[in-house]
């Protein structure tokens, strides 16, 4: 198209995480997806100065088509602020990431005590479970519901029946995955919910229970229904 346009960000979600704490020897990737007309160019600064290949052992890679900077096998000297500058003749935009290279002993994920917490709500209500995860290594987080099949919580092998409700994916941010929302709750939603966090060292998980109460004024109707009788 002939519509001239200054640079703009095309995927701000991928840029939300500004602080990257990465274990030594791992690969770091910073992205600044952008658009504009004419197509902007991208350059990178480290601590406000031009970032040159010779500034780090092994150099770095720039993937212009992915608007990314890649540094392999990071070391403590790679710590600092990395700024992408995206510009064309109509303007310039920039975004800064902070890289911290972690050298302490990485551990299996640590989950904040007391989370998720047991919750109760009435039928038709909303509830949320929160899980706070601390991990040196990049964690993968899942929310799991313990379900019943044929009236049983456990299979013939003695293992629990589980259903993955939510898992971190390409389009899911860390913040989004730490909260499980259940809208318009039904009696079937009652039960045990587990927040599971894993990394390359191991898996940790905490569970909480959801209690579902009858909606006020519906007691008679519920008592009359055989589905809810003990």
């Amino acid at each position: 198209s002939n519509n001239k346009r200054a640079p703009y960000w095309t995927n701000t979600e991928k840029m939300e995480k500004r602080l990257h704490a990465v274990p030594a020897a791992n690969t770091v990737k910073f992205r600044c997806p952008a658009g504009g007309n004419p197509m902007p160019t991208m350059r990178w600064l480290k601590n406000g100065k031009e970032f040159k290949q010779e500034h780090r052992i092994g150099g770095y890679k720039v993937r212009n088509q992915h608007w990314s900077l890649i540094m392999e096998s990071v070391v403590p000297s790679d710590k600092g602020n990395y700024t992408c500058v995206v510009e064309n003749e109509y303007g310039s935009i920039n975004h800064t990431y902070h890289l911290d290279v972690v050298e302490r002993s990485p551990h299996r994920p640590i989950l904040q005590a007391g989370l998720p917490a047991n919750a109760s709500t009435v039928v038709g209500g909303d509830v949320e479970f929160v899980c706070k995860v601390y991990s040196d290594a990049q964690p993968h987080i899942q929310w799991i519901k313990h379900v019943e099949k044929n009236g049983s919580k456990y299979g013939p092998d003695g293992l629990p029946y589980l259903k993955v409700l939510k898992a971190a994916g390409v389009n899911t941010t860390d913040k989004e995955i730490e909260v499980l929302y259940i809208r318009n709750v039904t009696f079937e939603d009652a039960g045990e919910y587990t927040c599971l966090a894993g990394n390359s060292i191991g898996i940790s998980f905490h569970s909480a229970w959801l209690t579902v109460l009858p909606a006020p004024g519906r007691e008679k109707e519920i008592t009359a229904s055989p589905d809810y009788l003990e």
Epitope: R108, N199, S200, I201
Partner: antibody, heavy 124, light 112 residues
Framework: EVQLLESGGGVVQPGRSLRLSCAAS????????MHWVRQAPGKGLEWVAV????????YYADSVKGRFTISRDNSKNTLSLQMNSLRVEDTAIYYC?????????????????WGQGTMVTVSS | DIVMTQTPLSLSVTPGQPASISCTSS???????????VYWYVQKSGQPPQLLIY???NRFSGVPDRFSGSGSRTDFTLKISRVEAEDVGVYYC?????????FGGGTKVEIK
């Protein structure tokens, strides 16, 4: 049957390189972290390195850091250990070990399956 | 690094008698999820280690119930209630909380 099969061991001179491989079968390799553990002749067990299920995280023992590189090819169900600047003290049986998976652990979350090991001898 | 110290170095047991191996960690292995991440292995001659006990006290599938694990935080014990000839081997404890993962020095169990 869940299996890990190491290969690539042999006799090598100090300062030279060697590449070990581990072929995995019987489980979804791409869903598990993988480790290397070694055992010097007549000695105990020493953890060497780990790589996350997708290869994005790697950790090494101080004794091999900067010399060894762990990698994986999920399309081929293969784990590798590139060993450079080998030393006499690297002489050991190297075991490939399955680590933590990505789902709910119905039992131990890793370190349950070991390969038979491959012998690496560093000698002049 | 977490140091795992195992005692005794070796153990000679009469078949049918109990055996006990101790392991001490330099830091607590009780994790935030309430589990204690100590694992026990046996390594028989010419074989790789085999998992016996995980998360302090859980027997791995196929492991006879004469094996049991116990302890808390930094002090752990593997017990064999009645030793059999096939139990000969070197026993190792391992911490599975953080890297570097570390093992005890091993306890050699032999039959009298």
């Amino acid at each position: 049957e869940v299996q890990l099969l190491e290969s690539g061991g042999g006799v090598v001179q100090p300062g030279r390189s060697l590449r070990l491989s581990c072929a995995a079968s019987g489980f979804t390799f791409s869903s598990y972290a993988m480790h290397w553990v070694r055992q010097a002749p007549g000695k105990g067990l020493e953890w060497v390195a780990v790589i996350s299920y997708d290869g994005s995280n790697k950790y090494y023992a101080d004794s091999v850091k900067g010399r060894f590189t762990i990698s994986r090819d999920n399309s081929k169900n293969t784990l590798s250990l590139q060993m450079n600047s080998l030393r006499v003290e690297d002489t050991a049986i190297y075991y490939c070990v399955r680590g933590a998976g990505r789902g709910y652990p119905y039992g131990p979350d890793g370190f349950d399956i070991w390969g038979q090991g491959t012998m690496v001898t560093v000698s002049s | 690094d977490i140091v795992m110290t195992q005692t005794p170095l070796s153990l000679s047991v009469t078949p049918g008698q109990p055996a006990s191996i101790s392991c001490t960690s330099s830091r607590s292995l009780l994790h935030s999820d309430g589990k204690t991440y100590v694992y026990w292995y046996v390594q028989k001659s010419g074989q790789p280690p085999q998992l016996l006990i995980y998360e302090l006290s859980n027997r791995f599938s196929g492991v006879p119930d004469r094996f049991s694990g116990s302890g808390s935080r930094t002090d752990f014990t593997l017990k064999i209630s009645r030793v059999e000839a096939e139990d000969v081997g070197v026993y190792y404890c391992m911490q599975y909380v953080e890297v570097p993962l570390t093992f005890g020095g091993g306890t050699k169990v032999e039959i009298k």
